[in-house]
């Protein structure tokens, strides 16, 4: 006999990285017929939704109008059909950005390199932080962590045309509070013609949307819950 229901999906719209004082919606998708959803924050019950009519609804949304460091952290949700509860969702790490200062991102030997060259990014922030994050813009939101007193280095190793794209970095004051983003650095990797044609660039965010980390449905990421969860979890573990 089944003791629990399948876990729901949890994600944030427009993104799990939320500039302070901006809005975000936490979405929890369970099953049609669920009579109650519970959103938990840092292990404690945060909010409850009892959708009506339950047989016509399989997703609820919890709106945060004004993101701040108190609202940043780990969220999960569960749902109930009759008296049977689901497994908890994966953890959603909600991050507040645009805190305090702006780091500087540089790249060595330079932003234009040849395939096979070793490339290292340097992220520098003079205020009190020891963790840095390097993000490559694009659908899969590649993220690397680095550590250092005022600067972290991110060696990419010998690069290929797949490394082409726009990078930014953040200083992290804790797992869920990040600095303003650095100015973008566009890495151009030239290779032979054949390699270039076989390695299309990730679709990047339009410049204006990256400014507020708005992932629109055009990127496809919101629709791909598994990828969304995977990206968010790997980022902060």
């Amino acid at each position: 006999q089944q003791q629990t229901l399948p876990k729901p999906f949890i994600w944030a719209e427009p993104h799990f990285m939320v500039p302070k004082e901006k809005q975000v919606t936490i979405c929890c998708q369970g099953n049609y017929g669920a009579v109650e959803y519970q959103l938990h924050f840092e292990g404690s019950l945060f909010a409850v939704d009892r959708p009506k009519p339950p047989e016509r609804i399989n997703k609820v949304q919890f709106y945060i109008p004004d993101m701040n460091s108190r609202m940043a952290g780990q969220y999960s949700c569960i749902y109930r059909v009759g008296e049977l509860w689901s497994e908890p969702s994966n953890l959603l790490d909600l991050v507040v950005t645009e805190m305090y200062d702006t780091p500087t991102l540089s790249v060595h030997p330079g932003p234009e390199v040849i395939s096979g060259e070793k490339v290292t990014f340097y992220c520098r922030l003079d205020t009190a932080t020891s963790m840095f994050l390097l993000l490559k813009e694009g659908r899969s939101s590649h993220v690397q962590r680095g550590y250092g007193k005022v600067q972290a280095e991110f060696p990419l190793g010998p690069v290929t045309t797949a490394h082409r794209g726009t990078y930014r970095c953040f200083g992290s004051y804790n797992n869920h509070a990040w600095s303003f983003p650095s100015e973008p650095v566009k890495l151009l990797v030239t290779g032979d013609i054949e390699n270039t044609s076989l390695a299309p660039e990730d679709p990047t965010f339009p410049a204006d949307t990256w400014g507020t980390y708005l992932l629109t449905t055009e990127t496809g990421l919101q629709k791909d819950h598994a990828l969304w969860d995977h990206t968010a979890q790997n980022l902060l573990r």
């Epitope: 945060f46 909010a47 409850v48 939704d49 009892r50 009506k52 609820v60 709106y63 945060i64 609202m71």
Partner: nanobody
Framework: QVQLVESGGGLVQAGDSLRLSCVAS????????MGWFRQAPGKEREFVAA????????YYADSVKGRFTISRDNAKNTVYLQMNSLKPEDTAVYYC????????????????????WGQGTQVTVSS
């Protein structure tokens, strides 16, 4: 912006009943989810009960379930907390809270969920 004013507190004996009221200013009361919290001396403020905008959803802390009832009258801009079978451990300052961003079927349980708070009304239950 909404202002919340609680009333109805007082000193009662264990086993007695009290009804707390919270009146909200403004014409948009029906768009707010409402909650009651309480804070005993030297303790954290804790969730008691909450009610959604249209009263479709109510939710209670385990410690008051079956004894307390939350209700609202949108025409009177008022939310109520009917407290029966009071116990000495119910002694606390009771606060009313409002959130303007909930859906019709949603309530908040965490303090950080709520935007607006009243000043509180004291409830003392003697044994």
């Amino acid at each position: 912006q909404v202002q919340l004013v609680e009333s109805g507190g007082g000193l009662v004996q264990a086993g007695d009943s009290l009804r707390l009221s919270c009146v909200a200013s403004g014409r948009t009361f029906s768009t707010y989810a409402m909650g009651w919290f309480r804070q005993a001396p030297g303790k954290e403020r804790e969730f008691v009960a909450a009610i959604s905008r249209n009263a479709d959803t109510t939710y209670y802390a385990d410690s008051v379930k079956g004894r307390f009832t939350i209700s609202r009258d949108n025409a009177k801009n008022t939310v109520y907390l009917q407290m029966n079978s009071l116990k000495p451990e119910d002694t606390a300052v009771y606060y009313c809270a409002a959130d303007r961003y909930s859906s019709n079927t949603q309530v908040g349980v965490a303090r950080t969920y709520y935007d607006y708070w009243g000043q509180g009304t004291q409830v003392t239950v003697s044994s």
